[in-house]
Interface confidence: medium
C-alpha cells in the first residue's frame, strides 16, 4: 500500500492490486470528503509517452480497466495521483512517483476448473487468461480438495503446484464413495535470488475459483496374477 | 527488456523486393506495437511503417504505401516489412522500434522504448 500525504490535513492511504493483465483496482482509507467531490486517482504511465488512465472513485474504491493494447507488461510503472475538487479548485497530491503494477498482484481465480475421473485417480485442469500464457512459468497454485459435506476449513491442501494447468489426485487422497469438492487458487510465484528484478513479482493470493465437484474414484487394490502369487 | 535484431537488409536493384526481419527476445512482445524507421545519409530518421500489438492495425508513411507491408507473428517474436518496387530513395539504415504506443501516435519516435541496431538497405538504379 501507499500513502498519499495530499495537501488536506489527513493522510490517505491506498492500496492498488491489479490483475496483471488489464485492471487495477484501488482502494482508499480516508474520510469522505464533503459533498459535491468527485475524487479520482490519475494513473500516469512512465514507460508509455501520453498513457495516462483515470480511476474515479466511488466511496473508498475505484478500478482501472485498461485498454487492450496497454496490457500490463513487467517494465510498467506509473505516477499515481490523487485528485479532488476543492472549493471550486482542483487539488492533486502525490500518492505513489513509481508505483510498479508487478509489485502489488493480485490475480484472478483460475477458471474453468474440470475434473476427469479414471480408475485409480482424478485428473484436475484449469485454465489460466490467454494474456497470462507468456508468463505460465511464473504461476504458483493451491489446491484445497475436501469431501463435500466438510467445511472448507477441514480440507486437505496440496501447494507448490508451479508452471501446470493440471493435477493428478491418487485415489489413495480420497474416500472412496464419496462425492469431493476442490477448489483452486494462484499467485505470481516467489523466483530464487538469481532472477532479473524486471521478473519479480509480489503480491497476494486469488480469490478461489468455483470448486468443482466429482465422485472419488475406487481404490485399486494389488494386481494379483490368476495364478496367484507363489 | 525488450532486445531488437535487425536482418534481410543488402544491396537491390531498383524495382526489386528485400524483406526485412527484426527478431525480439523477451516474453512480453505481444505487448508492443512495432515500428520501422530508415534514417538515409545526411536526413533525419523518418517513420516507415508501424504495426498494433495485436497485428489489428497497420500505418504508413505516404512514400512507401502501396508498395511496402508491415506484418508480425507474435508467436515467434518477429516482425516483418516486405518491401516491393525498391527505388534509389529507399536507400537507407532500416531501424526497428518497440514501443507502448497507445495514446501517441505510432509514426512519432519518443513513443518506442526499444530499438534495433539498423540494417543497410541499398537500392541502386
Known amino acids: 500500500s501507499v500513502t498519499g500525504e495530499g495537501q488536506g490535513p489527513r493522510s490517505r492511504t491506498f492500496t492498488c492490486l491489479t490483475n496483471n493483465i488489464l485492471r487495477i483496482d484501488c482502494h482508499w482509507s480516508a474520510p469522505e470528503l464533503g459533498q459535491g467531490s468527485s475524487p479520482w486517482l490519475l494513473f500516469t504511465s512512465n514507460q508509455a509517452p501520453g498513457g495516462t488512465h483515470k480511476c474515479i472513485l466511488r466511496g473508498s474504491e475505484c478500478t482501472v480497466v485498461l485498454p487492450p493494447e496497454a496490457v500490463l507488461v513487467p517494465s510498467d510503472n506509473f505516477t499515481i495521483t490523487f485528485h479532488h475538487c476543492m472549493s471550486g479548485r482542483e487539488q492533486v497530491s502525490l500518492v505513489d512517483p513509481e508505483y510498479l503494477p508487478r509489485r502489488h498482484v493480485k490475480l484472478d481465480p483460475p477458471s474453468d476448473l474440470q475434473s476427469n475421473i479414471s480408475s485409480g485417480h482424478c485428473i484436475l485442469t484449469w485454465s489460466i487468461s490467454p494474456a497470462l500464457e507468456p508468463m505460465t512459468t511464473l504461476l504458483s497454485y493451491e489446491l484445497a480438495f475436501k469431501k463435500q459435506e466438510e467445511a472448507w476449513e477441514q480440507a486437505q491442501h496440496r501447494d507448490h503446484i508451479v508452471g501446470v494447468t493440471w493435477l493428478i489426485l491418487e485415489a489413495f487422497e480420497l474416500d472412496p464413495g464419496f462425492i469431493h469438492e476442490a477448489r483452486l487458487r494462484v499467485q505470481m510465484a516467489t523466483l530464487e535470488d538469481d532472477v532479473v528484478e524486471e521478473e519479480r513479482y509480489t503480491g497476494q493470493w486469488s480469490e478461489w475459483s468455483q470448486p468443482v465437484c466429482f465422485q472419488a474414484p475406487q481404490r485399486q487394490g494389488p494386481l494379483i496374477p490368476p495364478w496367484g502369487w507363489p | 527488456q525488450v532486445q531488437l535484431v535487425e536482418s534481410g537488409g543488402g544491396l537491390v536493384q531498383a524495382g526489386g523486393s528485400l524483406r526485412l526481419s527484426c527478431a525480439a527476445s523477451g516474453r512480453y512482445f505481444y505487448a508492443y506495437g512495432m515500428g520501422w524507421f530508415r534514417q538515409a545519409p545526411g536526413k533525419e530518421r523518418e517513420f516507415v511503417a508501424a504495426i498494433s500489438y495485436n497485428g489489428g492495425s497497420t500505418y504508413y508513411a505516404d512514400s512507401v504505401k502501396g508498395r511496402f507491408t508491415i506484418s508480425r507473428d507474435n508467436a515467434k517474436n518477429t516482425v516483418y516489412l516486405q518491401m516491393n518496387s525498391l527505388k534509389p530513395e529507399d536507400t537507407a539504415v532500416y531501424y526497428c522500434?518497440?514501443?507502448?504506443?497507445?495514446?501517441?501516435?505510432?509514426?512519432?519516435?519518443?513513443?518506442?522504448?526499444?530499438w534495433g541496431q539498423g540494417t543497410q538497405v541499398t537500392v541502386s538504379s
Open positions: 522500434a518497440a514501443g507502448r504506443w497507445y495514446k501517441l501516435g505510432p509514426s512519432e519516435q519518443r513513443t518506442y522504448r526499444y
